[in-house]
Amino acid sequence: EPLSLAPESLEVSIDSARQCLHLKWSVHNLAYHQELKMVFQIEISRIKTSNVIWVENYSTTVKRNQVLRWSWESKLPLECAKHSVRMRGAVDDAQVPELRFWSNWTSWEEVDVQSSLGHDPLFVFPKDKLVEEGSNVTICYVSRSHQNNISCYLEGVRMHGEQLDPNVCVFHLKNVPFIRETGTNIYCKADQGDVIKGIVLFVSKVFEEPKDFSCETRDLKTLNCTWAPGSDAGLLTQLSQSYTLFESFSGKKTLCKYKSWCNWQVSPDSQEMYNFTLTAENYLRKRSVHLLFNLTHRVHPMAPFNVFVKNVSATNATMTWKVHSIGNYSTLLCQIELYGEGKVIQKQNVSVKVNGKHLMKKLEPSTEYAAQVRCANANHFWKWSEWTRRNFTTAEAAPSEAPDVWRNVKSVQGHCVVTLFWKPLSKLQANGKILFYNVVLENLDRPSTLKLLSIPAPANGTELTLDRCSYQIHVTANNSVGTSPASVIAVSGDPGNKEVEEERVKGTEDGFCLSWKPQPGDVTGYVVEWCERPGDPLCDLQWKNLGPNTTSTVVSSDAFRPGVRYNFRIYGISTERIPYLLEKKTGYSQELVPSDNPQVLMSNLTSYSFTLSWKDYAAESQPGFVQGYSLYLKSKAARCLPGSEKAVLSDDSICCKYKIDNPKQKTFVVENLQPASFYEFFLTPYTSVGEGPQGAFTKVTTPDEYSHI
C-alpha cells in the first residue's frame, strides 16, 4: 500500500540556546533490509498553523525503523512565539518509480516555550546569544501585561520593533558591530512600575582563517606544523577555538592541543607526499587552509653536534662536527662562518654526509675567534639548522713589527742623558702578550762593546746616562714565542740642539697643519715631536714618524685644548739613524683673549705727559699670541688727543683708546696732557680674538705748570 510509507512518530524538541528545533521521526512500513531514497517535505508555522514560514524538502536514504533527524535554526528566538511542525514523505527511488507521490501530512506538532516561562511580568530573548559582527539578529520581549507600554534600548538607544501579538514585540538588528568583550547590552523596561530586564548579546569579531600555515620535519619522524591564529575574537570565555589537522593521503586526523602548532607522526610506510587541511573552528564558523608538500623538501635539520676546533696554531685551525642523519642518501650543505671582533671575516660552504671538517687559514696570531656552523638539506633547501658556535684563540707568534721608538737627549754634567720612549705594539703587531723589551746599546766608537737592558712590560720607556760617545740603540719587543724586528735610533756625541728660528702656526678644528722644507742629501724620514700637556713636568711627549718624501702633516689630538700653546719640533733622520733638528713651530689649536693684564709702572710725570712701562711676561703662558696693547685713558676733556680714538667701555662709560700694535713694545708716553688735570688709565694686551679682561683704572693728576718753581 503506497500511502503507508509515511513519516511516523514525529517528535519535536527545542534547543533554546541555539534557537533550534530538532525533529525526530521514522518510517515503519519498509520491508526488512530494504533501503529506499525518500524525500520529506517539512513545514514550520508560527503563531497560527496557517502562517507557514518555512518549507523545506529533505532527501535521505531510509531503512526500516531507522530514526531520522533534521534540525532547523530559527531567526526568531523560540520563546517569542508558538511554532508548529508537520511533514509528509515520498519515495524518490528509481527502484520503485510507482511510489513517487506524497504521503499524508502528519498532524501539527506544537512547540510553545512561552508556557514554560516563569511568572515575571517581562522577559527578553535571546539570552547569551553569540553572533559574529556584521550578522543580523532578531530580539523580542514577552510581556505578561497588556496595559504596560514596554520600551527596549540597544546600548541606551531606543529600538523600534513590530508587534507579533499583544504580548510580543520583535526587533530586527542589522549588521551588529563588535562593541566590547562583555557584549552588547539590551534593556527593556515598562513605562509603569519598576520592571526592567536586560540581556547581553555577545558579538565576536569575524573569525579569521589561520595564517602562515607551514609544516617541517627535523628528523623525518615527526612533522611540526605551525600557523598564526587569526586575530582575537574579542570575547573572553564564549568562543573557544579548536584546530584539527587532516591528512588526505593517509586519511588520518588529529585534534591539536595548542592554538598555534601541532605535531604529526610521520608514517613508517615511507609516505613522501602529504596533503594537510588545517581546520580552525569555533562555535560560529569553520575556516580551513591547505598544504601539499613532499616530506623530503621540508627538512629543517637539527643543529650540528660534537663541534670542535682542533690543531689551533698561530694562523690556522680546523673545525670538525657531526650532523644528524636525515635519511640514508641525503647530503647536507653546511655553512661555516668565522667571526673576529664581532664581524664575519670568513664564510665557507661544505657538503657533508655525517662528519664535517673545515680548515680555517690566514688567521691572526693570539686572537680570539668564534666559528659557527649550520646545515641544510643540500638537495632540497628548506631551512638552515640553528648555529652551533665555538670560541677559540690562536697561538702566539713572534711580534711582527719593530716598536716605534723616539728619544729625548739632555746634556747633564758632561754626560748625555737619553730618555727613550716607545709606543706599545698594537694587538696585530704584538701577536701575543709582550713580556719585556730588550734595549741594546752599541758604542759606535768601540763597536765590540754591547750593553743589554731588559725592561719588563708594560713599561713604555727608560732613561740612559751615556758618555759623550756616539751610540746606536736597538729596541725589540718580546713575547713568549720570540722577538720583534729591532728599532734602531742613534745618539751622537753632539746633542744637536742647534738654534732654529721658531715659526708660528695656526691651529684649526682638524689640528695643526705643519710643513717643512725638503732636506738636501739622504734622509731616511722625519719625526714631528710635541707635548700634549705643555707646562706639565711629565709633558706627555708624542711623536709621529713620517716617510722621507713627506714634507707636511696634520697633527691632531683630542688632548688639544683652546688657549694652550703647543710647540712642535721637526727632525730629519739621517742614514746613520741620527735625528737632527730642522724646524720649530708653535701655535694654538684655538686662541683665546688674554687671561690677565701686565703690571704697569708710571714714571716721568710732568704737567703735559707721563711714561708707562710694563714688564714682558711669559708668552708661553698666554692663551693666544699677543699682537699688541690697548691703552684706555679717561679725562674731563670732550675730545680725544691725537693718536687716540673714542671708545665705549663695558660699563657704557666713554674714554679714549690708544692702540699699540707692536707686541714687543714695553713703554708708552702719554703726551699732550693738560696741567693740573685728573686722568685715569688702564692697559690690556690683545690677541687675534680680542682684549684681556677689563681691570681697575689707575688715577693720575698732572702737576700745574709752576709747581717746580
Epitope: 516563569g118 515575571d120 562593541i179 566590547r180 568583550e181 562583555t182 547590552n185 530586564k197 536586560g198 547581553v200
Partner: antibody
Framework: DVQLVESGGDLVKPGGSLRLTCVAS????????MAWVRQAPGKGLQWVAN????????YYLDSLKSRFTISRDNAKNTLYLQMNSLKTEDTATYYC??????????WGQGTLVTVSS | EIQMTQSPSSLSASPGDRVTITCKAS??????VAWYQQKPGKVPKLLIY???TRHTGVPSRFSGSGSGTDFTLTISSLEPEDAATYYC?????????FGQGTKVEIK
Amino acid sequence: DVQLVESGGDLVKPGGSLRLTCVASGFTYSDYYMAWVRQAPGKGLQWVANINYDGSSTYYLDSLKSRFTISRDNAKNTLYLQMNSLKTEDTATYYCVRGLTWDFDVWGQGTLVTVSS
Amino acid sequence: EIQMTQSPSSLSASPGDRVTITCKASQDVDTAVAWYQQKPGKVPKLLIYLASTRHTGVPSRFSGSGSGTDFTLTISSLEPEDAATYYCQQYSRFPLTFGQGTKVEIK
C-alpha cells in the same frame, strides 16, 4: 517582593574553606545573571565573580580564579560561592547581587567572612 | 585591568547645591559604566547604568554623562538623604572594576 538572602559567613583560619549560599525570591531566578561582590571593612566594592543564566559561563577576578568557584542551582533558586585556601585579605562582607546585565540592580544584605588566625 | 579613579574622594556640600563627581577610566570603556549609592550601614543601590540611563525609581535629580574615559555623576540639587558614598563601575572589560568611592557629606 524581590529578595536575596546570603548565609555561610563565618570566622575561619587562613587556609580554610567556606561555602556561601544565597537564596533568591520574588523573581524568576533563571532569567538573571548573578554575581558576588565583596567589601572589606571600611573599604570600597570589589567584584568577585559572575555566572550566566544557566551556569554555563562563569567569570572571575583573575586573582581569585584558582580558589573561588561560583555556581547556581536554578531549581532551588540558589547561588553559591565556594571559597578555598582562604587568606586574611579575603576578610570582607560578601554581597549576593542580581545583574541586569553586568550592572547590579538588587543586592542582598551581605554575609561577613573573617579570615584570621 | 581597567582602573576607575574617582574624584574628589570626599566632599561637603549644602542642601540645594549642585554636586558633581567624576570618574576616569584608565582606558576606553565606551558607555559601559554604572553608578551606585551606598548609605552608611546599608547595601549599595544602582542609580545609573550605561553611563546615563537612570534606573527605575531613582529621583530625577541624579544624572549621569560621559563616554570613553571620562564620566560624571551629577546631583542637581542636593537633599539631606543624599549623604552617602558613591561608586562608579565599568563593565566594558573583565575584570569588572569599581572606583574607590566618593563620600558626600551634608553641611
